[in-house]
Amino acid sequence: SSPCPQAWGPPGVQYGQPGRSVKLCCPGVTAGDPVSWFRDGEPKLLQGPDSGLGHELVLAQADSTDEGTYICQTLDGALGGTVTLQLGYPPARPVVSCQAADYENFSCTWSPSQISGLPTRYLTSYRKKTVLGADSQRRSPSTGPWPCPQDPLGAARCVVHGAEFWSQYRINVTEVNPLGASTRLLDVSLQSILRPDPPQGLRVESVPGYPRRLRASWTYPASWPCQPHFLLKFRLQYRPAQHPAWSTVEPAGLEEVITDAVAGLPHAVRVSARDFLDAGTWSTWSPEAWGTPSTGTIPKEIPAWGQLHTQPEVEPQVDSPAPPRPSLQPHPRLLDHRDSVEQVAVLA
């Protein structure tokens, strides 16, 4: 059997660190057997069998010129093996970032904080943390560790499915290379890393007969589980074309009627989502949707579907944002959003 322990990595390759002493091991001999060492393709003897170092070659203060292939020969001239030296560095702790687009699953991505120059792999696992004692603020790793399954195709990402929203988790990402291992531990709670995907299906429509009104509607992101316990609230922004500043409102549900649009101008509208109890952060903005208020006279009947602001239709004021709306509202599927008075009655 070979006297050379096989480091993790491709066979026949041995590893060292620049500026450090490196020992190369002749793989095809018995431990301690004297050998001669040569650089591949060069006749010059690097180290003879009388060095007293047996089957090892010592390179003091290795540098990049020492990288390459070495040949070791036994006393009778037989080939003891070939060894390729690759220089690099031990791993540093990777940088880890975790995010959740819903309240049941989260994913973690990582990246090396320093390039080692050596073959590298990552071990990923997690524990669920629990509070010690009823009155104690201390937390300790309790259950696990479980593997955090990595994405196929080598993407630097792993996913924890079926996470508990109120629990804390300790993520372990260990960077491993032939010179060692280094671990980053990251404590995460779903509440703090929750960032929903942006709302979907944003539509902007004119309100016939109302030259300063636009109706925007949207749906929950598809990634958000359909359960009534964890709701989303929304933030809507709109602005006329060529106008730099956004006006912002917090709609009560899945639609909003803008009452201070600029007549005749197309308007950009976008919407963002957040957990309704302010866990985590706001989603990114949805792609913008565009709409232009209708032209024409005001109809005698107010459309039943709109939560219309009751401002009169006066001359357009580009910088008059709509007043903010209540942000904490029940799940859209649980209530009819036709009338805010009706909503209050249901809530009461």
Partner: antibody, heavy 118, light 107 residues
Framework: EVQLLESGGGLVQPGGSLRLSCAAS????????MTWVRQAPGKGLEWVSS????????QYADSVKGRFTISRDNSKNTLYLQMNSLRAEDTAVYYC???????????WGRGTLVTVSS | DIQMTQSPSSLSASVGDRVTITCQAS??????LNWYQQKPGKAPKLLIY???NLQTGVPSRFSGSGSGTDFTFTISSLQPEDIATYYC?????????FGPGTKVDIK
């Protein structure tokens, strides 16, 4: 010679923008994370932002999140800090630093002064 | 974020004196603690890394110890060129934080 050289500082009005650069030389820039640290006049050191070698992960101090963006161009051996919506409290000397193991700053630039004032 | 506190905030000592600065972290940071020296108008300089390791080229009169939450930085024999502000800094977290600094001058 191993060194970092910052540039791009100056006087800017509140709400304005500035882009800092840090030119690295003497080491393999693309192998290392890079960091911005700032120091307000007469005050202590404050970590601002860091970026990993490949540029795919970044971290920011809460005080600058959403306003500052760190980036790098490994082909130019240059680190950047785009600073938007600047406030008076952003007035500081901004240092570029090379960390080992993400947070051990073994090489620093001389710094560039950013003054936010009307 | 992990908070770092340092004491004293300033001190005066004579040349040759032993000077000790302490640093405390708001939570366990293992040994991920560094010490820096900053002279007026200059960039900081790393002296000690990971609690007790002397950075290459730094004089051996500087030393550090501790782990967990409590750390100590020592100058065994203060020299005139050691007049500076000294900062501790944790990097256990991915958001590094510095202590407020200790200003050292000569009596």
């Amino acid at each position: 010679e191993v060194q970092l050289l910052e540039s791009g500082g100056g006087l800017v009005q509140p709400g304005g923008s500035l882009r800092l650069s840090c030119a690295a030389s003497g080491f393999t820039f693309s192998w290392y994370s890079m960091t911005w640290v700032r120091q307000a006049p007469g005050k202590g050191l404050e970590w601002v932002s860091s970026i990993v070698p490949y540029g795919d992960l970044t971290q920011y101090a809460d005080s600058v999140k959403g306003r500052f963006t760190i980036s790098r161009d490994n082909s130019k051996n240059t680190l950047y800090l785009q600073m938007n919506s600047l406030r008076a409290e952003d007035t500081a000397v901004y240092y570029c630093a090379k960390p080992e193991d993400w947070g051990r700053f073994d090489l620093w630039g001389r710094g560039t002064l950013v003054t936010v004032s009307s | 974020d992990i908070q770092m506190t340092q004491s004293p905030s300033s001190l005066s000592a004579s040349v040759g004196d032993r000077v000790t600065i302490t640093c405390q972290a708001s939570q366990d940071i293992n040994n991920y603690l560094n010490w820096y020296q900053q002279k007026p108008g200059k960039a900081p300089k790393l002296l000690i890394y990971d609690a007790s390791n002397l950075q290459t080229g730094v004089p051996s009169r500087f030393s550090g110890s501790g782990s967990g939450t409590d750390f100590t930085f020592t100058i065994s024999s203060l020299q005139p060129e050691d007049i500076a502000t000294y900062y501790c800094q944790q990097h256990e977290s991915q958001s590094p934080t510095f202590g407020p600094g200790t200003k050292v001058d000569i009596k």
